[in-house]
């Protein structure tokens, strides 16, 4: 039971966190215009990777997609790459997690197939997060750099007489968006792989060793069960030493994987 | 097209308060627009006095922060003007507009004159 | 604030000549964001309120004819009525629109000589 809540609930983090990966890179806020001294302003620029917006006081926003890939900084291209890598891979994370998901039933599926199928997505899940977490993490230490660069030079005067406020940029919803669904799908990811080592079947088996008292056949089989999720997930113990030893599914009847869905 | 209309005492005296009051019609006040006050006095030139906007966030001219009030009724699609401890530098045409695009005032009513006196 | 400096003060042309009205701003109306000039202009007839003429210092307000045009960035800007016409005698004035407070230049008056 505890293997399937774990296994659940890690799909579920991964999911939002994906969710919120897709979110943070279609966002138009990774950067906004700095206030610093002027809560109020009568035009409010902001930044994504795809496009810049500029709102209006008045309430009139226009924004302008980025129609160049030449001219864009390398670090913004940067970025891009590691958001929809991060995207790729949560996708197929999650394509792949559906099918390990123990509660789905897929055919006569075996538990060392989902074990494996949840370990892939499992590794996809921190991979997807750390792209996010470093696409997001690289961007906000360009915002940092340019900040303190623009800040050195906020006023460019002519004589002193004409002032050229240039505009300064700060963090913007996207980047927090960007890593907590990052950490969202990190943890997801990192569930799942806990999850995996609870489904994998055992393949220590130990050897049945049968005591033959007078007149009667009876075995005594030490270890021969695997550590039992108590979700029915036991497999058949292979026959080892067929000394008047019996199977524990010859013992008793376990219920079958397929029983829950 | 959206439409102004200024409505008001005509006369005003020295310390009272001056209150306008601007309907609206053909748009919504709600609307992703900013509902300005500004000013004309008699043979000089413009003064913007402040606005709401469509999130209902206000700004003021600093010269006039202290004294200005600006709201509005969404119910009765109208937006007004306060402006206290008026004197006779107060007295002047005042228009309401409409700003948008470029934050330009694209449409003004046709302006009341206040006149402060005793 | 930004101080807004129209000149000439007053300006009078003969009809179907051109007209040209300068506006300084004390600092750049440019915006980095959108590499957009917020200096608008408006046209006062007597007894009416003034209409707008041209915003983001050279995009034509509908319905306002070609003959006027905006042109200018940062801190110094131009309107011009290429042809002018009868109708064209009133004040003009420049606005910033770029930056709290929005203040107005003291006005042009074209007249016809």
């Known amino acids: 039971m505890a293997v399937t809540a774990c296994q659940g609930l890690g799909f579920v983090v991964s999911l939002i966190g994906i969710a919120g990966i897709i979110a943070a890179t279609c966002m138009d806020q990774w950067s906004t215009q700095d206030l610093y001294n002027n809560p109020v302003t009568a035009v409010f620029n902001y930044q994504g990777l795809w496009r810049s917006c500029v709102r209006e006081s008045s309430g009139f926003t226009e924004c302008r997609g980025y129609f160049t890939l030449l001219g864009l900084p390398a670090m913004l291209q940067a970025v891009r790459a590691l958001m929809i890598v991060g995207i790729v891979l949560g996708a197929i994370g999650l394509l792949v997690s559906i099918f390990a998901l123990k509660c789905i039933r897929i055919g006569s599926m075996e538990d060392s197939a989902k074990a494996n199928m949840t370990l892939t997505s499992g590794i996809m899940f921190i991979v997807s997060g750390l792209c996010a977490i470093a696409g997001v993490s690289v961007f906000a230490n360009m915002l940092v750099t340019n900040f303190w660069m623009s800040t050195a030079n906020m006023y460019t005067g002519m004589g002193g007489m004409v002032q050229t406020v240039q505009t300064r940029y700060t963090f913007g919803a996207a980047l927090f968006v960007g890593w907590v669904a990052g950490g969202l799908t990190l943890i997801g990811g990192v569930m799942m792989c806990i999850a995996c080592r609870g489904l994998a079947p055992e393949e220590t088996n130990y050897k049945a060793v049968s005591y033959h008292a007078s007149g009667h056949s009876v075995a005594y089989k030490p270890g021969g069960f695997k550590a039992s999720t108590g979700f029915g997930s036991n497999t058949k113990n292979k026959k080892i030493y067929d000394g008047g030893a019996r199977t524990e599914d010859e013992v008793q009847s376990y219920p079958s994987k397929h029983d829950y869905v | 097209q959206v439409q102004l209309q200024e409505s008001g005492p005509g006369l005003v005296k020295p310390s009272e308060t001056l209150s306008l009051t601007c309907t609206v019609s053909?748009?919504?006040?709600?609307?992703?627009?900013?509902w300005n006050w500004i000013r004309q006095p008699p043979g000089k030139g413009l003064e913007w006095i402040g606005y709401?906007?469509?999130?209902?966030?206000?700004a003021y001219n600093p010269s006039l922060k202290s004294r200005v009030t600006i709201s509005r009724d969404t119910s009765k699609n109208q937006f007004s003007l306060k402006l206290s401890s008026v004197t006779a530098a107060d007295t002047a045409v005042y228009y309401c507009?409409?700003?948008?695009?470029?934050?330009?005032?694209?449409?003004w009513g046709q302006g009341t004159l206040v006149t402060v006196s005793s | 604030d930004i101080v807004m400096t129209q000149s000439p003060d007053s300006l009078a042309v003969s009809l179907g000549e051109r007209a040209t009205i300068n506006c300084k701003s004390s600092?750049?109306?440019?915006?980095?964001?959108?590499?957009?000039?917020?200096l608008t202009w408006y046209q006062q007839k007597p007894g009416q309120p003034p209409k707008l003429l041209i915003y983001?210092?050279?995009t034509r307000e509908s319905g306002v004819p070609d003959r006027f045009s905006g042109s200018g960035s940062g801190t110094d800007f131009t309107l011009t009525i290429s042809s002018l016409q009868a109708e064209d005698v009133a004040v003009y004035y420049c606005?910033?629109?770029?930056?709290?407070?929005?203040?107005f230049g003291q006005g042009t008056k074209v007249e016809i000589k």
């Open positions: 507009a409409t700003s948008y695009y470029g934050n330009s005032f694209i449409y």
């Open positions: 053909g748009g919504s006040i709600s609307s992703n627009y900013a």
């Open positions: 709401i906007n469509y999130s209902g966030n206000t």
């Open positions: 600092q750049s109306l440019l915006n980095s964001g959108n590499q957009k000039n917020y």
């Open positions: 983001w210092a050279s």
């Open positions: 606005q910033n629109a770029y930056s709290f407070p929005w203040t």
